[in-house]
Interface confidence: low
């Protein structure tokens, strides 16, 4: 129905000028990791260009995770936003550019591109369709933009990667400012329903963050993401936390989830990159 069609809508404000980062990991999405602990940590949000709180699951995740706001600011923000930090290419490139090509364990044999650190170029390879790693791009251009040398070494411009729920591909996401609402809860509750790659038709529930409800979907039996629950009750239990509305002076106020027709999707929370 139309409600589902609008699930990926991102309400945004004005665009910001291109972003240049001190460290490439500052561009990584806040990654709570696969564990289920609930720990308060900070990450640099490339969309708001600020250090913000997020919930960390206690294991894995990525380098964009700091114990304190101060540490985050020290690593990822600077006084002069226009000053280009001159560091070596090796330091500035995202870590995943240096991973080996990995076809994964499936047998889809899809043409993809990876950055070959030996030749310093993006090259074509055959991807199996599942697993693998993040050195995996749908287009040559995308691979070049993220991993090859630019004129001034690597700089992150409109950098953000979004995991495509259908084929686990990485697609670029333009740098936008999120709306006034953000979801305060496990980040997988904001990911779209993902059937996965197999052929079963299991009845499952996922949390639809647009409407704030748990909805049924058909799961293929393998793969997919963590927004996948065997019962509606389990889904609500994991994802029932409300939205948080930002107020002008940086404070946060809890707001109820019942906003029937309000389409709110948070750009930075939608970026869902699989753990390497």
């Amino acid at each position: 129905d139309s409600e589902e069609d609008e699930e990926h809508t991102i309400i945004t404000d004005t665009e910001l000028p291109p972003l240049k980062l001190m460290h490439s990991f500052c561009a990584f999405k806040a990654d709570d990791g696969p564990c289920k602990a609930i720990m308060k940590r900070f990450f640099f949000n490339i969309f708001t260009r600020q250090c913000e709180e997020f919930i960390y699951g206690g294991c894995e995740g990525n380098q964009n995770r700091f114990e304190s706001l101060e540490e985050c600011k020290k690593m990822c923000t600077r006084d002069n936003a226009n000053r280009i930090i001159k560091t070596t290419l090796q330091q500035e490139k995202p870590d995943f550019c240096f991973l080996e090509e990995d076809p994964g364990i499936c047998r889809g044999y899809i043409t993809r591109y990876f950055y070959n650190n030996q030749t310093k170029q993006c090259e074509r390879f055959k991807y199996g369709g599942c697993l693998g790693n993040m050195n995996n791009f749908e287009t040559l251009e995308e691979c070049k933009n993220i991993c090859e040398d630019g004129p001034n070494g690597f700089q992150v411009d409109n950098y953000g990667t979004q995991l495509n729920a259908v084929n686990n591909s990485l697609t670029p996401q333009s740098t936008k400012v999120p709306s006034l609402f953000e979801f305060h809860g496990p980040s997988w509750c904001l990911t779209p329903a993902d059937r996965g790659l197999c052929r079963a038709n299991e009845n499952r529930f996922y949390y639809n963050s647009v409407i704030g409800k748990c909805r049924p979907f058909k799961y293929s039996g393998c793969g997919g993401n963590e927004n996948n629950f065997t019962s509606k009750q389990e889904c609500l239990r994991a994802c029932k936390k409300g939205f948080i509305q930002r107020i002008s002076k940086g404070g946060l106020i809890k707001t109820k989830r019942k906003r029937k027709k309000q389409r709110v999707k948070i750009a930075y929370e939608e970026i869902f990159v699989k753990n390497m």
């Epitope: 720990m39 894995e60 697993l131 039996g221 793969g223 996948n228």
Partner: antibody
């Protein structure tokens, strides 16, 4: 219903490797949750050892990280524990379990492993 | 690591009376209004069985004579009235931080 069953040797010699298998029935280990090894020493102390997440990612107790490995065979719906360089201190009942959100909801019956020359 | 200290190590309670088991954490296991403390029962020769999750939630199928309370670093498991089948060792377990840790156990016996 979900069931887990541990299997492996009852006796292992010191310095050798301990290999255990957990066979899961009633739920696919690639469909969800995380799948764990937990051990209970004589005297009842319980220690979480490692898990393999349904996505394939793994996590180990830092106290064991240098000598532990957890893997899986998705075609058989099994996951495995390998503990290297065992000593008599590793004698314990080894359980496999499933973690649902923040608690362990299913456990195997456990297998007693004795490390002795 | 978060260390969990259970007390007493063992206790003997008359049938129909109340058993109270304490679990103290070396640091808070609370976050955002939730307490990430679970309780398990282990009967002799059996694996642990979940009784209470997140401090006070009774697991499905567990009798209402079991209850959990507490927050921060101090948690309590109550059994009232105690029945013969409750003879077991009880463990607390925190899931706020990895590695997940268990208490040393409290052995419940009938007087």
């Amino acid at each position: 219903d979900v069931q887990l069953q541990e299997s492996g040797p009852d006796l292992v010699k010191p310095s050798q490797s301990l290999s255990l298998t957990c066979t899961v029935t009633g739920y696919s280990i690639t469909s969800g949750y995380s799948w764990h090894w937990i051990r209970q020493f004589p005297g009842n102390k319980v220690e979480w050892m490692a898990y393999i997440h349904y996505s394939g990612s793994t996590r180990y107790n830092p106290s064991l990280k240098s000598r532990i490995s957890i893997t899986r065979d998705t075609s058989k719906n099994q996951f495995f524990l390998q503990l290297n360089s065992v000593t008599t201190e590793d004698s314990a009942t080894y359980y496999c379990g499933r973690r649902a959100w923040t608690w362990f909801d299913y456990w195997g019956q456990g297998t007693l492993v004795t490390v002795s020359a | 690591d978060i260390v969990l200290t259970q007390s007493p190590g063992s206790l003997a309670v008359s049938l129909g009376q109340r058993a109270t088991i304490s679990c103290k954490a070396s640091q808070s296991v609370d976050y955002d209004g939730n307490s990430f403390m679970n309780w398990y029962q282990q009967r002799p020769g059996q694996p642990p069985k979940l009784l209470i999750y997140e401090a006070s939630n009774l697991e499905s199928g567990i009798p209402v004579r079991f209850s959990g309370s507490g927050s921060g670093t101090d948690f309590t498991l109550n059994i009232h009235p105690v029945e013969e089948e409750d003879v077991a060792t009880y463990y607390c377990q925190q899931s706020k931080e990895d590695p997940w840790t268990f208490g040393g156990g409290t052995k419940l016996e009938i007087k």
